[in-house]
Interface confidence: low
């Protein structure tokens, strides 16, 4: 399977809320010893390999922002912690899966990585990750919605492996 | 103030290839993104892709994918569009252009490239 | 791709009149930005999110308009507003540009 970004640069104003989105791509093995691990963690610019170090979003970890559940399946960080810190995540039954982050400030503005971890019981994992850039902007010339950038066909199928 | 200075004139023979840079001054290089837009002569204003100097993204109008390519040099603040296997239909003046979320608020003054055998 | 269709493609008015010019789109989008080019000019930011005039544009410039249908309009035209005017949709990719309304003054 691969991990897709479908837009690669997220330019919001102060005080809007945003929407990060992933998605699962290629086949994916419903089989009853299958279970993906999805979360998200911010990252830095300019490492030889993108998404290596991993960042606490908002002071979570990205062992508080994960998912956990079989295939396609719905799932979504409904626990307090996550909340009180005006965030959350979420997985549709399309391989979709997201991060809201509410009440954006400067302080937001980085670099944003979800990750995929294919856990074969008592055998192997899978990983892959995707990656997308956040501008948080603020004044006269601040966007009044958030500003998507698509990603170039070679980006959206971000299949690094973790 | 902002500027985006670009590169000269340029003749150039069907299937070469060639590349105009634009020089930013005046503002935070890596933050905004730089759009290129073509017109060519006596004819209207089109997209040809953008680049994202903080990250090095590039976003090409599927038209031009495969013989545009956009790279930029952090160190000198500097976008380059390179378009390849000219053609006399690529003679346009090439403008760079920095983008402010959803407008291009400063343009180049413009290449010229004229491509003729 | 959200083609823009821009009427009309030439006008000559005179000074002092209304102008006004339409960017019809193909399908339904956020906002519209309007841009100015002058003979031998690079273009100029006009209008950006359909109606807000950017630093330095005369008040006579108005912009409106949503969904798919957004109107430039000049009020009492002066002569150095001869020029072609662009619409451009930044809102669904790609990125695409109006074929352009040239301003001839009388």
């Known amino acids: 399977f691969k991990v897709a970004t479908p837009y690669s640069l997220y330019v919001c104003p102060e005080g809007q809320n945003v929407t990060l989105t992933c998605r699962l791509l290629g086949p994916v093995d419903k089989g009853h010893d299958v279970t993906f691990y999805k979360t998200w963690y911010r990252s830095s610019r300019g490492e030889v390999q993108t998404c290596s170090e991993r960042r606490p979003i908002r002071n979570l970890t990205f062992q508080d922002l994960h998912l956990h559940h079989g295939g396609h399946q719905a799932a979504n960080t409904s626990h307090d912690l996550a909340q009180r810190h005006g965030l959350e995540s979420a997985s549709d039954h399309h391989g979709n899966f997201s991060i809201t982050m509410r009440n954006l400030t400067l302080l937001d503005s980085g670099l944003y990585c979800c990750l995929v971890v294919e856990i074969r019981h008592h055998h192997s994992e899978h990983r892959v990750h995707g990656a997308m850039e956040l501008q948080v902007q603020t004044g006269k010339d601040a966007p009044s919605n958030c500003v998507v950038y698509p990603s170039s066909s070679q980006d959206s199928e971000n299949i690094t492996a973790a | 103030q902002v500027q985006l200075v670009q590169s000269g004139a340029e003749v150039k023979k069907p299937g070469a290839s060639v590349k105009v840079s634009c020089k930013a001054s005046?503002?935070?290089?890596?933050?905004?993104?730089i759009s290129w837009v073509r017109q060519a002569p006596g004819q209207g204003l089109e997209w040809m892709g953008e680049i994202y100097p903080g990250s090095g993204n590039t976003y090409y109008y599927e038209k031009f994918k495969g013989r545009v390519t956009m790279t930029r040099d952090t160190s000198t603040s500097t976008v380059y569009m390179e378009l390849s296997s000219l053609r006399s239909e690529d003679t346009a003046v090439y403008y760079c252009a920095r983008v402010l979320v959803s407008v291009m608020d400063y343009w180049g003054q413009g290449t010229l490239v004229t491509v003729s055998s | 791709e959200i083609v823009l269709t821009q009427s009309p493609d030439f006008q000559s008015v005179t000074p002092k009149e209304k102008v006004t010019i339409t960017c019809s789109a193909s399908s339904s989008i956020n906002y519209i930005t309007w841009y100015q080019q002058k003979p031998d000019q690079s273009p100029k930011l006009l209008i950006k999110d359909t109606s807000k005039l950017a630093s330095g544009v005369p008040s006579r410039f108005s912009g409106s308009g949503s969904g798919t249908d957004f109107t430039l309009t000049i009020n009492s035209l002066e002569a150095e507003d001869a020029a072609t005017y662009y619409c451009h949709q930044r809102s669904s990719y790609p990125w695409t540009f109006g074929q352009g309304t040239r301003l001839e003054i009388k």
């Open positions: 005046g503002y935070t290089f890596t933050d905004y993104v």
